[in-house]
Amino acid sequence: MKVLQEPTCVSDYMSISTCEWKMNGPTNCSTELRLLYQLVFLLSEAHTCIPENNGGAGCVCHLLMDDVVSADNYTLDLWAGQQLLWKGSFKPSEHVKPRAPGNLTVHTNVSDTLLLTWSNPYPPDNYLYNHLTYAVNIWSENDPADFRIYNVTYLEPSLRIAASTLKSGISYRARVRAWAQCYNTTWSEWSPSTKWHNSYREPFEQHHHHHHH
Protein backbone atom coordinates (compact mmCIF):
# COMPACT_ATOMS: atom_id res chain seq x y z
CA MET A 1 0.00 0.00 0.00
CA LYS A 2 1.48 3.32 -1.11
CA VAL A 3 0.49 6.95 -1.40
CA LEU A 4 0.22 7.95 -5.05
CA GLN A 5 -0.66 11.64 -4.51
CA GLU A 6 0.46 13.13 -1.21
CA PRO A 7 -2.11 14.80 1.05
CA THR A 8 -2.96 18.40 0.28
CA CYS A 9 -4.95 20.35 2.84
CA VAL A 10 -7.04 23.51 3.00
CA SER A 11 -8.40 25.28 6.07
CA ASP A 12 -11.64 27.18 6.51
CA TYR A 13 -9.73 29.30 9.07
CA MET A 14 -12.30 28.50 11.67
CA SER A 15 -12.70 24.91 12.78
CA ILE A 16 -12.12 22.48 9.92
CA SER A 17 -9.23 21.64 7.64
CA THR A 18 -9.78 19.19 4.80
CA CYS A 19 -7.02 16.94 3.50
CA GLU A 20 -7.25 14.86 0.32
CA TRP A 21 -4.90 12.28 -1.14
CA LYS A 22 -4.79 9.33 -3.51
CA MET A 23 -3.58 5.81 -2.89
CA ASN A 24 -1.98 3.56 -5.50
CA GLY A 25 -5.06 1.36 -5.70
CA PRO A 26 -8.61 0.90 -4.41
CA THR A 27 -8.60 1.50 -0.65
CA ASN A 28 -11.18 1.34 2.11
CA CYS A 29 -9.97 4.60 3.64
CA SER A 30 -11.97 4.43 6.87
CA THR A 31 -10.85 0.95 7.85
CA GLU A 32 -7.30 0.89 6.47
CA LEU A 33 -5.97 4.40 7.13
CA ARG A 34 -5.62 6.96 9.91
CA LEU A 35 -4.37 10.54 9.64
CA LEU A 36 -2.78 11.80 12.86
CA TYR A 37 -2.36 15.54 13.31
CA GLN A 38 -0.83 17.59 16.08
CA LEU A 39 -0.28 21.29 16.64
CA VAL A 40 3.43 22.04 16.92
CA PHE A 41 3.35 23.78 20.29
CA LEU A 42 3.91 23.23 23.98
CA LEU A 43 1.65 20.56 25.55
CA SER A 44 -0.40 20.03 22.40
CA GLU A 45 -2.49 16.96 21.79
CA ALA A 46 -2.36 14.36 19.01
CA HIS A 47 -5.68 13.91 17.19
CA THR A 48 -6.80 11.10 14.92
CA CYS A 49 -8.85 11.67 11.79
CA ILE A 50 -10.72 8.75 10.21
CA PRO A 51 -10.72 9.30 6.44
CA GLU A 52 -13.60 8.72 4.07
CA ASN A 53 -13.47 7.44 0.52
CA ASN A 54 -13.40 10.01 -2.24
CA GLY A 55 -13.49 7.91 -5.39
CA GLY A 56 -11.90 4.48 -5.72
CA ALA A 57 -8.34 5.30 -4.63
CA GLY A 58 -9.03 8.74 -3.14
CA CYS A 59 -9.38 9.60 0.53
CA VAL A 60 -10.54 12.72 2.34
CA CYS A 61 -10.23 13.64 6.00
CA HIS A 62 -11.84 16.49 7.93
CA LEU A 63 -9.51 17.68 10.67
CA LEU A 64 -11.25 19.40 13.60
CA MET A 65 -9.42 22.39 15.06
CA ASP A 66 -10.49 24.43 18.07
CA ASP A 67 -9.31 27.72 16.60
CA VAL A 68 -6.74 28.90 14.07
CA VAL A 69 -4.10 31.60 14.41
CA SER A 70 -1.59 32.56 11.75
CA ALA A 71 1.40 30.93 13.45
CA ASP A 72 -0.24 27.50 13.74
CA ASN A 73 1.64 24.61 12.19
CA TYR A 74 0.52 20.98 12.33
CA THR A 75 2.44 17.75 11.83
CA LEU A 76 0.58 15.17 9.73
CA ASP A 77 1.24 11.42 9.85
CA LEU A 78 -0.63 9.03 7.58
CA TRP A 79 -0.73 5.50 8.96
CA ALA A 80 -1.86 2.15 7.59
CA GLY A 81 -1.95 0.07 10.75
CA GLN A 82 1.61 0.18 12.13
CA GLN A 83 3.09 1.41 8.84
CA LEU A 84 3.85 5.10 8.41
CA LEU A 85 2.99 5.85 4.79
CA TRP A 86 3.66 9.58 4.72
CA LYS A 87 4.80 12.37 7.02
CA GLY A 88 4.29 16.06 6.40
CA SER A 89 3.21 19.37 7.85
CA PHE A 90 0.45 21.87 7.26
CA LYS A 91 0.15 25.56 8.10
CA PRO A 92 -3.57 26.42 7.92
CA SER A 93 -3.07 30.16 7.41
CA GLU A 94 -1.11 29.49 4.22
CA HIS A 95 -3.80 27.27 2.68
CA VAL A 96 -7.13 28.95 3.34
CA LYS A 97 -10.30 28.15 1.45
CA PRO A 98 -13.13 30.21 2.95
CA ARG A 99 -16.50 28.75 3.76
CA ALA A 100 -19.16 29.31 1.12
CA PRO A 101 -21.60 32.20 1.70
CA GLY A 102 -25.17 31.19 2.46
CA ASN A 103 -28.77 32.39 2.39
CA LEU A 104 -28.54 33.99 -1.03
CA THR A 105 -31.77 35.88 -1.65
CA VAL A 106 -32.93 37.95 -4.62
CA HIS A 107 -35.23 40.82 -3.67
CA THR A 108 -37.32 41.90 -6.66
CA ASN A 109 -39.78 44.18 -4.88
CA VAL A 110 -37.70 47.33 -5.42
CA SER A 111 -38.86 48.92 -8.64
CA ASP A 112 -36.56 48.06 -11.55
CA THR A 113 -33.71 47.14 -9.19
CA LEU A 114 -32.54 43.71 -8.15
CA LEU A 115 -31.07 43.45 -4.67
CA LEU A 116 -29.09 40.30 -3.97
CA THR A 117 -28.14 39.61 -0.36
CA TRP A 118 -26.32 36.73 1.26
CA SER A 119 -24.79 35.86 4.62
CA ASN A 120 -21.15 36.10 5.59
CA PRO A 121 -20.17 32.51 6.47
CA TYR A 122 -18.07 33.59 9.47
CA PRO A 123 -19.06 34.85 12.93
CA PRO A 124 -18.01 38.44 13.74
CA ASP A 125 -15.19 37.28 16.02
CA ASN A 126 -13.44 35.38 13.21
CA TYR A 127 -10.57 37.17 11.49
CA LEU A 128 -11.99 36.51 8.02
CA TYR A 129 -15.35 38.10 8.83
CA ASN A 130 -14.13 41.58 7.89
CA HIS A 131 -11.84 40.47 5.09
CA LEU A 132 -14.09 38.66 2.62
CA THR A 133 -14.91 39.92 -0.82
CA TYR A 134 -17.28 38.16 -3.18
CA ALA A 135 -18.06 37.19 -6.74
CA VAL A 136 -21.68 36.89 -7.81
CA ASN A 137 -22.46 34.73 -10.82
CA ILE A 138 -25.77 35.33 -12.62
CA TRP A 139 -26.85 33.26 -15.60
CA SER A 140 -29.90 32.63 -17.71
CA GLU A 141 -31.49 29.21 -17.68
CA ASN A 142 -32.63 29.80 -21.26
CA ASP A 143 -29.42 31.10 -22.80
CA PRO A 144 -26.05 29.53 -21.83
CA ALA A 145 -24.24 32.54 -23.33
CA ASP A 146 -25.98 34.89 -20.90
CA PHE A 147 -23.52 34.34 -18.07
CA ARG A 148 -21.98 37.13 -16.03
CA ILE A 149 -19.79 37.71 -12.96
CA TYR A 150 -20.05 40.71 -10.66
CA ASN A 151 -17.10 41.36 -8.32
CA VAL A 152 -18.17 42.69 -4.94
CA THR A 153 -15.03 44.28 -3.51
CA TYR A 154 -16.68 46.02 -0.57
CA LEU A 155 -17.46 44.23 2.71
CA GLU A 156 -21.26 44.39 2.65
CA PRO A 157 -22.72 41.06 1.49
CA SER A 158 -25.07 42.53 -1.08
CA LEU A 159 -25.26 43.57 -4.71
CA ARG A 160 -27.64 45.96 -6.46
CA ILE A 161 -28.11 45.82 -10.20
CA ALA A 162 -30.63 47.35 -12.54
CA ALA A 163 -33.17 44.75 -13.63
CA SER A 164 -32.82 46.17 -17.13
CA THR A 165 -29.25 44.87 -17.39
CA LEU A 166 -30.83 41.42 -17.64
CA LYS A 167 -33.39 40.26 -20.16
CA SER A 168 -36.99 40.61 -19.17
CA GLY A 169 -39.47 37.77 -19.03
CA ILE A 170 -37.01 34.95 -18.46
CA SER A 171 -35.66 33.04 -15.45
CA TYR A 172 -32.22 33.65 -14.00
CA ARG A 173 -30.13 31.92 -11.39
CA ALA A 174 -27.50 33.41 -9.09
CA ARG A 175 -24.81 32.05 -6.82
CA VAL A 176 -22.02 33.66 -4.80
CA ARG A 177 -18.56 32.71 -3.60
CA ALA A 178 -15.96 34.37 -1.37
CA TRP A 179 -12.24 34.91 -0.98
CA ALA A 180 -9.93 36.89 1.29
CA GLN A 181 -7.02 38.80 -0.18
CA CYS A 182 -5.24 39.13 3.18
CA TYR A 183 -4.43 35.41 3.26
CA ASN A 184 -4.29 35.03 -0.53
CA THR A 185 -6.99 32.37 -0.19
CA THR A 186 -8.48 30.24 -2.90
CA TRP A 187 -12.10 30.90 -3.78
CA SER A 188 -14.73 29.24 -1.64
CA GLU A 189 -17.17 26.81 -3.16
CA TRP A 190 -20.20 28.44 -4.76
CA SER A 191 -23.23 28.92 -2.56
CA PRO A 192 -26.39 27.02 -3.49
CA SER A 193 -28.02 28.91 -6.37
CA THR A 194 -31.30 30.75 -6.19
CA LYS A 195 -33.77 31.31 -9.03
CA TRP A 196 -36.05 34.20 -9.94
CA HIS A 197 -38.12 35.38 -12.86
CA ASN A 198 -36.80 38.67 -14.20
CA SER A 199 -39.56 41.04 -15.27
CA TYR A 200 -39.55 44.80 -15.39
CA ARG A 201 -41.42 47.55 -17.22
CA GLU A 202 -39.34 49.13 -19.93
CA PRO A 203 -39.47 52.92 -19.93
CA PHE A 204 -41.80 54.24 -22.68
CA GLU A 205 -38.96 56.01 -24.54
CA GLN A 206 -36.89 52.84 -24.60
CA HIS A 207 -39.88 50.81 -25.80
CA HIS A 208 -40.63 53.41 -28.50
CA HIS A 209 -36.99 53.48 -29.58
CA HIS A 210 -36.90 49.71 -29.94
CA HIS A 211 -40.18 49.78 -31.90
CA HIS A 212 -38.60 51.92 -34.64
CA HIS A 213 -35.80 49.49 -35.15
Partner: antibody, heavy 119, light 107 residues
Framework: QVQLVQSGAEVKKPGASVKMSCKAS????????MHWVRQAPGQGLEWIGG????????SYNQKFKDRATLTADRSSNTAYMELSSLRSEDTAVYYC????????????WGQGTLVTVSS | DIQMTQSPSSLSASVGDRVTITCQAS??????LNWYQQKPGKAPKLLIY???RLHSGVPSRFSGSGSGTDYTFTISSLQPEDIATYFC?????????FGGGTKVEIK
Protein backbone atom coordinates in the same frame (compact mmCIF):
# COMPACT_ATOMS: atom_id res chain seq x y z
CA GLN B 1 -19.50 27.58 31.11
CA VAL B 2 -16.11 26.26 32.27
CA GLN B 3 -15.46 26.63 35.98
CA LEU B 4 -12.32 25.94 38.00
CA VAL B 5 -12.72 25.45 41.75
CA GLN B 6 -9.58 25.51 43.90
CA SER B 7 -8.92 24.17 47.37
CA GLY B 8 -8.86 26.43 50.43
CA ALA B 9 -6.19 28.62 51.96
CA GLU B 10 -3.12 27.05 53.57
CA VAL B 11 -0.69 28.22 56.24
CA LYS B 12 2.68 26.48 56.18
CA LYS B 13 6.03 26.70 57.95
CA PRO B 14 9.27 27.32 56.03
CA GLY B 15 10.69 24.08 54.63
CA ALA B 16 7.29 22.37 54.49
CA SER B 17 5.35 21.34 51.38
CA VAL B 18 1.88 22.28 50.20
CA LYS B 19 -0.41 20.45 47.78
CA MET B 20 -3.39 22.27 46.31
CA SER B 21 -6.13 21.11 43.96
CA CYS B 22 -8.15 22.51 41.09
CA LYS B 23 -11.34 20.82 39.87
CA ALA B 24 -12.47 21.62 36.34
CA SER B 25 -16.07 21.45 35.15
CA UNK B 26 -15.28 20.38 31.60
CA UNK B 27 -16.69 17.51 29.60
CA UNK B 28 -13.31 16.04 28.77
CA UNK B 29 -10.23 17.05 30.71
CA UNK B 30 -7.88 15.69 28.07
CA UNK B 31 -8.53 18.43 25.51
CA UNK B 32 -7.01 21.02 27.82
CA UNK B 33 -3.83 22.02 29.58
CA MET B 34 -3.84 23.03 33.23
CA HIS B 35 -1.35 25.71 34.16
CA TRP B 36 -0.43 27.26 37.48
CA VAL B 37 0.30 30.95 37.99
CA ARG B 38 1.09 32.73 41.23
CA GLN B 39 0.75 36.29 42.46
CA ALA B 40 2.61 37.54 45.53
CA PRO B 41 0.81 40.22 47.56
CA GLY B 42 0.60 43.44 45.56
CA GLN B 43 2.81 41.94 42.84
CA GLY B 44 2.55 40.76 39.26
CA LEU B 45 1.85 37.31 37.85
CA GLU B 46 4.36 34.50 37.52
CA TRP B 47 3.90 31.32 35.46
CA ILE B 48 4.93 28.16 37.33
CA GLY B 49 4.20 25.44 34.78
CA GLY B 50 1.61 23.49 32.86
CA UNK B 51 0.33 19.95 32.44
CA UNK B 52 -1.48 18.01 29.74
CA UNK B 53 -3.84 15.79 31.79
CA UNK B 54 -4.35 13.40 28.88
CA UNK B 55 -0.77 12.23 28.47
CA UNK B 56 0.86 13.59 31.62
CA UNK B 57 3.27 15.83 29.74
CA UNK B 58 4.50 18.76 31.79
CA SER B 59 6.39 21.98 31.21
CA TYR B 60 7.92 23.98 34.02
CA ASN B 61 9.37 27.41 34.56
CA GLN B 62 13.02 26.53 35.36
CA LYS B 63 12.74 28.65 38.49
CA PHE B 64 10.28 26.09 39.93
CA LYS B 65 11.53 22.92 38.21
CA ASP B 66 13.03 21.39 41.35
CA ARG B 67 10.21 22.34 43.75
CA ALA B 68 6.93 22.15 41.84
CA THR B 69 5.18 18.93 40.83
CA LEU B 70 2.10 18.99 38.61
CA THR B 71 -0.24 15.99 38.43
CA ALA B 72 -3.83 15.26 37.48
CA ASP B 73 -6.56 12.75 38.16
CA ARG B 74 -8.48 12.35 34.92
CA SER B 75 -11.33 10.44 36.54
CA SER B 76 -12.29 13.46 38.63
CA ASN B 77 -11.09 16.25 36.30
CA THR B 78 -8.84 17.48 39.06
CA ALA B 79 -5.32 18.88 38.78
CA TYR B 80 -2.84 19.20 41.61
CA MET B 81 0.23 21.26 42.31
CA GLU B 82 2.68 20.43 45.06
CA LEU B 83 5.31 22.97 46.04
CA SER B 84 8.09 21.83 48.35
CA SER B 85 10.81 23.49 50.44
CA LEU B 86 8.59 26.48 51.08
CA ARG B 87 10.08 29.83 52.01
CA SER B 88 8.52 33.12 53.02
CA GLU B 89 8.74 34.52 49.48
CA ASP B 90 6.40 31.73 48.33
CA THR B 91 3.58 33.50 50.15
CA ALA B 92 1.16 34.22 47.31
CA VAL B 93 -2.18 33.47 45.74
CA TYR B 94 -1.81 30.44 43.48
CA TYR B 95 -4.14 30.24 40.50
CA CYS B 96 -4.90 27.32 38.24
CA UNK B 97 -5.64 28.40 34.68
CA UNK B 98 -7.00 26.38 31.78
CA UNK B 99 -5.96 26.58 28.15
CA UNK B 100 -7.09 24.55 25.18
CA UNK B 101 -4.36 21.94 24.60
CA UNK B 102 -1.37 23.51 22.91
CA UNK B 103 -2.50 27.12 23.40
CA UNK B 104 -0.60 29.92 25.12
CA UNK B 105 -3.48 31.96 26.53
CA UNK B 106 -5.22 31.31 29.84
CA UNK B 107 -8.89 31.24 28.95
CA UNK B 108 -10.29 30.25 32.36
CA TRP B 109 -8.99 30.82 35.87
CA GLY B 110 -9.70 29.38 39.30
CA GLN B 111 -10.54 31.67 42.20
CA GLY B 112 -7.07 31.21 43.70
CA THR B 113 -5.58 29.51 46.75
CA LEU B 114 -3.79 31.71 49.27
CA VAL B 115 -0.65 30.08 50.65
CA THR B 116 0.98 31.81 53.62
CA VAL B 117 4.48 30.71 54.63
CA SER B 118 5.36 31.88 58.09
CA SER B 119 7.36 30.61 61.03
CA ASP C 1 13.62 35.03 30.17
CA ILE C 2 11.70 37.48 28.01
CA GLN C 3 11.04 40.73 29.86
CA MET C 4 7.65 42.32 29.32
CA THR C 5 7.71 46.06 29.94
CA GLN C 6 4.24 47.47 30.37
CA SER C 7 3.45 51.18 30.43
CA PRO C 8 2.14 53.21 32.02
CA SER C 9 2.10 51.51 35.42
CA SER C 10 -1.06 53.47 36.26
CA LEU C 11 -3.40 55.93 34.58
CA SER C 12 -6.45 57.97 35.37
CA ALA C 13 -9.07 58.69 32.71
CA SER C 14 -12.66 59.87 32.44
CA VAL C 15 -15.64 57.73 31.50
CA GLY C 16 -15.86 57.68 27.70
CA ASP C 17 -12.14 58.31 27.20
CA ARG C 18 -9.97 56.23 24.91
CA VAL C 19 -7.36 54.39 26.96
CA THR C 20 -4.17 52.89 25.54
CA ILE C 21 -1.67 50.60 27.26
CA THR C 22 1.54 49.38 25.66
CA CYS C 23 3.62 46.29 26.21
CA GLN C 24 7.15 45.85 24.92
CA ALA C 25 8.88 42.47 24.81
CA SER C 26 12.65 42.14 25.10
CA UNK C 27 12.60 40.05 21.90
CA UNK C 28 10.21 39.14 19.08
CA UNK C 29 7.23 37.16 20.43
CA UNK C 30 5.53 36.47 17.07
CA UNK C 31 2.11 37.82 18.07
CA UNK C 32 1.79 35.47 21.06
CA LEU C 33 0.67 38.36 23.23
CA ASN C 34 -2.38 38.19 25.48
CA TRP C 35 -4.16 40.74 27.69
CA TYR C 36 -5.93 40.13 31.00
CA GLN C 37 -8.10 42.20 33.31
CA GLN C 38 -7.90 41.74 37.07
CA LYS C 39 -10.17 43.34 39.61
CA PRO C 40 -9.17 43.55 43.31
CA GLY C 41 -9.45 40.21 45.09
CA LYS C 42 -10.41 38.40 41.89
CA ALA C 43 -8.67 36.13 39.40
CA PRO C 44 -7.50 37.58 36.06
CA LYS C 45 -9.82 37.31 33.05
CA LEU C 46 -8.69 36.83 29.47
CA LEU C 47 -9.71 39.72 27.22
CA ILE C 48 -7.49 39.51 24.12
CA TYR C 49 -5.41 36.61 22.85
CA UNK C 50 -2.87 36.30 20.04
CA UNK C 51 -2.45 40.10 19.79
CA UNK C 52 -5.93 41.01 18.55
CA ARG C 53 -8.40 38.17 19.02
CA LEU C 54 -11.30 39.01 21.32
CA HIS C 55 -12.07 36.24 23.82
CA SER C 56 -15.68 35.06 23.82
CA GLY C 57 -18.06 37.33 25.72
CA VAL C 58 -15.63 40.26 25.88
CA PRO C 59 -17.11 43.65 24.86
CA SER C 60 -15.91 45.04 21.53
CA ARG C 61 -14.63 48.26 23.14
CA PHE C 62 -11.51 46.22 24.02
CA SER C 63 -9.00 45.69 21.23
CA GLY C 64 -5.37 44.82 20.67
CA SER C 65 -2.75 45.32 17.99
CA GLY C 66 0.97 45.07 17.38
CA SER C 67 3.70 42.78 16.08
CA GLY C 68 7.30 41.82 16.76
CA THR C 69 8.18 43.33 20.14
CA ASP C 70 5.62 46.14 20.44
CA TYR C 71 1.95 45.65 21.34
CA THR C 72 -0.94 47.90 22.26
CA PHE C 73 -4.16 47.37 24.19
CA THR C 74 -7.01 49.86 23.77
CA ILE C 75 -10.30 50.56 25.50
CA SER C 76 -12.18 52.68 22.98
CA SER C 77 -14.59 54.19 25.50
CA LEU C 78 -13.78 53.69 29.17
CA GLN C 79 -16.67 52.43 31.30
CA PRO C 80 -16.92 52.47 35.12
CA GLU C 81 -16.76 48.65 35.17
CA ASP C 82 -13.37 48.77 33.41
CA ILE C 83 -11.63 49.94 36.59
CA ALA C 84 -9.04 47.20 37.09
CA THR C 85 -5.41 46.26 36.58
CA TYR C 86 -4.47 45.04 33.10
CA PHE C 87 -1.64 42.62 32.40
CA CYS C 88 0.03 41.53 29.16
CA UNK C 89 1.52 38.04 28.81
CA UNK C 90 3.77 36.49 26.19
CA UNK C 91 3.32 32.84 25.23
CA UNK C 92 5.98 32.52 22.58
CA UNK C 93 9.04 31.50 24.59
CA UNK C 94 9.41 29.56 27.84
CA UNK C 95 9.01 30.58 30.53
CA UNK C 96 5.81 32.47 29.71
CA UNK C 97 6.05 35.88 31.32
CA PHE C 98 3.75 38.74 32.28
CA GLY C 99 4.04 42.50 32.24
CA GLY C 100 4.05 44.37 35.53
CA GLY C 101 0.47 45.56 35.11
CA THR C 102 -1.34 48.86 34.48
CA LYS C 103 -3.80 50.11 37.06
CA VAL C 104 -6.68 52.00 35.42
CA GLU C 105 -8.68 54.45 37.54
CA ILE C 106 -11.52 56.86 36.86
CA LYS C 107 -10.84 60.59 37.16
Amino acid sequence: QVQLVQSGAEVKKPGASVKMSCKASVYTFTGYNMHWVRQAPGQGLEWIGGLHPGNGDTSYNQKFKDRATLTADRSSNTAYMELSSLRSEDTAVYYCALTTAGRAWFAYWGQGTLVTVSS
Amino acid sequence: DIQMTQSPSSLSASVGDRVTITCQASQDISNYLNWYQQKPGKAPKLLIYYTSRLHSGVPSRFSGSGSGTDYTFTISSLQPEDIATYFCQQGNTLPWTFGGGTKVEIK
